[in-house]
């Protein structure tokens, strides 16, 4: 049956009607409205924007729109005592200081409350010492320094370039290496694309531009003071010393003009190879310390930021389902920005706004979705996904019983080359089918489908004629829904050409230069890519909320489970002798995957053939589909990461942004050759294999015939 038949309404209220109502001009207008002043989490400006969105969503026709507030730990620079880094001479005199703020972009010189660049949640401190350059501060970079080059970071201030991995992982690695402070900087090799001018003349990062960002290692905990529970008025709060995920050493970000001044004097060891060298005119020596003439000079950090419990506000809008009001499809994205949020998050928030408007228009004409749709404007995402996590903690019992799907809606663009999708395998077929019905916005693909341009520009590495869909990692608001609660999740945005643009993120990410003009002049003047993303996100929500049978295909999970089992087995097989010595076998896991594949296949046949006019049977089959993602949740969580509970996927322990498959086994195997007690280490591998086997088998059994 078509979606329109689901709620017995006139055929004009179908997916096409919803998609046709979405307008690029509206998205443009909303983006402009959302980006004129900063909307930093915890500020009055962001509260006012929450109230504006609440009011407009009501006008658009949602059944109810509520503000939900929480009191969470946030972090701000000291207004009267700015953060900076100095080069000091032997007398302690400051001979160079890093900048105190970014030069504001033209037209924004008189805007107040632009927060200067800082690393959110850095502790206060004034460490002083020699500098060590640690490349991207990845796990492998510290292995190279400590194991191969025998360089000790203990007591040193490390300087790391942004990119490749989440900044919080960099800080964690530096802490573990014994560093007393961390300086993060944007190297032009990563944030300046060749042949493009810097802002305001192009989309590249100017030398004074700096990337803000939090440096937490929350591992899904939400508010650092109330892990597992909502930060409401009766919440018990931990002391700051017991807070989750806070860094223990001062951290500060700088731009490449300032980095040049610090790096040009570096002495000590030469960089190990070209992968450690950026594009500045400096030697990229590793250190420690400055070269001959400057060897008596040191680096000193001056960090005075404070962490304080602050009120944040989510906006939650409801469009009640006509047939299954107790089944929730959620579309959520954040509202808080570091400064103007031209891309992050407001290019996403503007799309959500237009999607709400379109759904509201249909509702005003008498239509309702089959299932309830919840719309969310999250607060404090930039401070650790706090708004979404606190709301999910507060509503976890409802969500785990009623949550069908979560579609994330942060930045709609990070480039203008092709589509990028990360989602659960359950949604692969939904995404393929939807993109085949949408028109490509790409030049040279006029009259062709989005699926076609996406497949051509971003082909699947495994299956010819299909586009790439990536694993979900973290670093965004789907985290709690997917990794903690096991709700099927997905995200879509327009992205850059990863082949030719090797820089990390987009150059102006989290800087003051992320403005409306950046988007309107350089990324998407016609807002056609924004419109396409609105169609993909909105279309997914429409189908998830309105299809009679949930548009999930469990067979696609079977395919990836086999792929992931092969991958982890191959990693383990790099140690054949130890596998033999400790009797490590993956046979049980492969057997469970085989069982899953067979049961999923039989389930799909039943799904095709059952009587869809029988509401009990329909509900039963849909529940099996809805609860399949939930079946991959281990209530005990992953080792040392209790809020990452999905056994098939977790954020990488070495890069929060990346997804890892069979993470429990992967982490048990990681660097196993260096473990002091190999017997215990291989025992943990065996334990993790057994957990994965049990989970896959248990998930398979949820798809078996009920009686």
């Amino acid at each position: 049956k078509s979606s329109s038949e689901a709620t017995n309404i006139t055929p004009k209220h179908n997916m096409k009607a919803f998609l046709d109502e979405l307008k690029a001009e509206n998205i443009k207008k909303f983006l402009h409205n959302f980006t004129q002043i900063p909307h930093l989490a915890g500020t009055e400006q962001n509260f006012q924007l929450a109230k504006q969105i609440q009011s407009q969503w009501k006008e658009f026709g949602l059944d109810s729109v509520e503000l939900t507030h929480y009191d969470v730990l946030l972090s701000y620079p000291n207004k009267t005592h700015p953060n900076y880094i100095s080069i000091i001479n032997e007398d302690g005199n400051e001979i160079f200081n890093t900048s105190l703020f970014e030069p504001p972009p033209a037209g924004y010189e008189n805007v107040s409350d632009i927060v200067p660049p800082f690393s959110a949640f850095s502790p206060q401190g004034m460490p002083e010492g020699d500098l060590v350059y640690v490349n991207y501060a990845r796990t492998e970079d510290f292995f190279k320094l400590e194991r191969d080059m025998k360089i000790n970071c203990s007591g040193k201030i490390v300087i790391a370039r942004y990119g490749k991995v989440f900044r919080g992982n960099k800080v964690k690695n530096a802490q573990l290496a014994g560093a007393t402070g961390v300086i993060l900087y944007s190297d032009p090799a990563d944030y300046f694309a060749p042949g493009v001018k810097s802002y305001p003349d192009g989309w590249n990062l100017p030398g004074g531009g700096v990337q803000r960002g939090n440096i937490l290692n929350l591992n899904g905990a939400g508010d650092p003071l109330t892990p597992g529970y909502p930060a409401n008025e009766y919440a018990y709060r931990r002391g700051i010393a017991e807070a989750v995920g806070l860094p223990s050493i001062p951290v500060h970000p700088i731009g490449y003009y300032d980095a040049q001044k610090l790096l040009e004097k570096m002495g000590g060891s030469a960089s190990p190879d070209s992968s450690w060298r950026g594009s500045l005119k400096v030697p990229y020596n590793v250190g420690p310390g400055f070269t001959g003439n400057f060897s008596t000079q040191k680096v000193k950090m001056h960090i005075h930021s404070t962490s304080e419990v602050t009120r944040i506000y989510n906006v939650i809008g409801t469009l009640r389902g006509a047939v299954e009001p107790d089944r929730y499809v959620i579309l959520g994205g954040h509202r808080d920005s570091w400064v103007f949020g031209g891309i992050d998050p407001q290019s996403g928030a503007a799309v959500v706004h237009e999607i709400v408007r379109s759904f509201g228009t249909l509702k005003k004409e008498g239509w309702r979705p089959r299932r309830t749709i919840l719309f969310a404007s999250w607060d404090a995402e930039e401070f650790g996904l706090l708004g979404s996590t606190e709301w999910a903690e507060e509503n976890s019992r409802l969500l785990q019983e009623r949550g069908v799907a979560y579609i994330n809606a942060d930045s709609s663009i990070e480039g203008n080359y092709t589509l990028r999708v990360d989602c659960t395998p359950l949604m692969y077929s939904l995404v393929y089918n939807l993109t085949k019905e949408l028109e490509s916005p790409d030049e040279g693909f006029e009259g062709k489908s989005l699926y076609e341009s996406w497949t051509k520009k971003s082909p699947s590495p495994e299956f010819s004629g299909m586009p790439r869909i990536s694993k979900l990692g973290s670093g965004n608001d789907f985290e709690v829904f997917f990794q903690r609660l096991g709700i099927a999740s997905g995200r879509a945005r327009y992205t850059k050409n990863w082949e030719t643009n090797k820089f990390s993120s987009y150059p102006l990410y989290h800087s003051v230069y992320e403005t409306y003009e950046l988007v309107e002049k350089f990324y998407d003047p016609m807002f056609k890519y924004h419109l396409t993303v609105a169609q993909v996100r909105g279309g997914m929500v429409f189908e998830l909320a309105n299809s009679v049978v949930l548009p999930f295909d469990c067979r696609d999970y079977a395919v990836v489970l086999r792929k992931y089992a092969d991958k982890i087995y191959n990693i383990s097989m790099k140690h054949p002798q130890e596998m033999k010595t400790y009797s490590v076998s993956f046979d049980s896991l492969f057997s469970a995957v085989k069982n899953f594949t067979e049961i999923a296949s039989k389930f799909s046949e039943r799904l095709r053939d059952f009587d869809k006019s029988n509401p009990i049977l329909l509900r039963m089959m849909n529940d099996q589909l809805m609860f399949l993602e939930r079946a991959f949740i281990d209530p005990l969580g992953l080792p040392d990461r209790p809020f990452y509970r999905h056994v098939i996927y977790a954020p990488s322990s070495h890069n929060k942004y990346a997804g890892e498959s069979f993470p429990g086994i992967y982490d048990a195997l990681f660097d196993i050759e260096s473990k002091v007690d190999p017997s215990q280490a291989w025992g943990e591998v065996k334990r993790q294999i057994s957990i994965a086997t049990f989970t896959v088998q248990a998930a398979a059994e949820t798809l078996s015939e009920v009686a």
Partner: nanobody
Framework: QVQLVESGGGVVQPGRSLRLSCVAS????????MHWVRQAPGKGREWVAV????????YYADSVKGRFTISRDNSKNTLYLQMNSLRPEDTAVYYC????????????????WGQGTTVTVSS
Amino acid sequence: QVQLVESGGGVVQPGRSLRLSCVASGFPFISYGMHWVRQAPGKGREWVAVISYDGSNRYYADSVKGRFTISRDNSKNTLYLQMNSLRPEDTAVYYCAKERIFGVLTPDDFDIWGQGTTVTVSS
């Protein structure tokens, strides 16, 4: 239009003080490093001092170090030069100048100059 207007010059006795001002208009003052440069009668231009766009760094010519202080008030689009312990050799026309490149400090890369204000140190 883009302009820099200096003021505060005059005739002063050796050992005394003077404060020069330079009001900027027509460009985002807050985003650019600013310099003071001087030209003594019959001589070439001599760089005096520079301040970064945010005031975080200030550098001086050896000839004025410890006596002159460069400062700025971004809310007033104004650059200052406080000159103490003035000497006859400080006699010159003082110009303020704007850095050409947004957000960076260079020793001699200026694109906008004021018309100058004359300082005469004489007993």
